[in-house]
């Protein structure tokens, strides 16, 4: 946020940049939270735009019985590993095909025990205020589906009739990590010393970090003909004086008429 200065008063202005503003030879360059010629005004909204998507990662282990373990499987650049990965990925894509949040799988380690597959199931959803619930539900469905497939697709008489067969008892969910996004916390942090006065309001499921000086929200302060200004003690209305009235009161709603004719004051509420 920059405000340009022209003329002789500029040198004076340079030494008067407030709130951490810096002079660049023409104007005060204001830090994020401030604006105005001298960076004297506090912004009324802060961009805390959420990420487009939120991700979750589930650490799972399954045991594949339809492939013989060889040492080559430990080498991620070997043909054995590449072929196993291709088939495992294809199988898991089928298993999780009904989950809209499912992105894919990532094998982290293969070890002996038939083939014990340590892998991550990757989930992603569009950001909405309900993203936690959406991802929690998706992780539950992942658990159900992997449990089902590893119970059904098993070797019978040493024969595997499916793309892959599993050991029913080898299925474990180790850990679930969801990307954290807390707009309230972000808003408070970015508002710094004004954090107590900034709040998050949602519009079209998008969070806005605003102070009461931002118009058009439910917390907006109505200063009538006055101007809302943020200070360390909170939002205040700065009332104006016109040719005919001066205004006062908490919200500048008390107009006092300047009477030139009678020489006394007449109040309007």
């Amino acid at each position: 946020r920059t405000t340009t200065c022209f003329g002789d008063g500029c040198q004076n202005t340079a030494s008067r940049c407030k709130n951490g503003g810096t002079w660049d030879g023409l104007k005060c360059q204001c830090p994020n939270l401030y604006y105005g010629e001298l960076c004297e005004e506090v912004v009324s909204s802060i961009d805390i735009g959420p990420p487009e998507t939120i991700s979750a990662q589930m650490e799972l282990t399954v045991t594949v019985t339809s492939v013989k373990f060889t040492e080559e499987l430990k080498n991620h650049s070997s043909q054995e590993f590449q072929e196993f990965k291709q088939t495992f990925t294809e199988q898991m894509n089928i298993v999780y095909s009904g989950i809209p949040e499912y992105v894919g799988v990532n094998i982290t380690k293969l070890r002996l025990g038939s083939v014990v597959v340590e892998h991550d199931v990757l989930l992603r959803t569009k950001y909405t205020p309900e993203y936690k619930t959406v991802l929690d539900n998706a992780t539950e469905v992942v658990k159900e589906k992997i449990t089902k497939v590893t119970t059904q697709q098993i070797m019978i008489n040493d024969i595997c009739s499916d793309m892959m067969c599993f050991n029913t008892t080898g299925t474990q969910v180790q850990n679930i990590t969801v990307t954290q996004y807390d707009p309230e916390e972000d808003c408070r942090k970015m508002a710094k010393e004004y954090g107590d006065y900034f709040v998050v309001e949602y519009r079209d499921q998008k969070p806005y970090c605003i102070s009461p000086c931002e118009p058009g929200f439910s917390v907006s302060k109505n200063c009538n003909l006055g101007k809302c200004q943020m200070s360390l003690s909170g939002p205040q209305c700065l009332c104006v004086t016109t040719e005919t009235h001066w205004y006062s009161g908490e919200t500048c709603n008390q107009g006092t008429q300047k009477s030139l004719v009678y020489g006394h004051h007449h109040h309007h509420h």
Epitope: K68, E83, Q86, C160, M163
Partner: nanobody, 124 residues
Amino acid sequence: DVQLQASGGGAVQAGGSLRLSCAASGDITRRCMGWFRQAPGKEREGVAGISEDGITIYADSVKGRFTISKDNAKNSLYLQMNSLAPEDTANYSCAASILNRVGCRQLSYEYIYRGQGTQVTVSS
């Protein structure tokens, strides 16, 4: 991936014989290998399979007439077809499993790599 190319097809009279070959680009010793066929307007079906340890499996329709074999040294798979009938007319292709696949006793999902086919036409 393993590359597969079938050859040896042709036109033959009913009751005749043909030997199909399948050349593989890599090691087939640790793979299940199989032959599949697809007739016009019909689904692809498994004909014969051989596991890495040499155990063979056949579709009921070809049992006793077809023999599957492999030569690991030559990375080749074969299908000897005797007593051919018009219903054997189809495009024949070979297929391979991933390395170290076990439990191949079906003619279905385990063969994930598929090659170019060769046409077999049996006339009465």
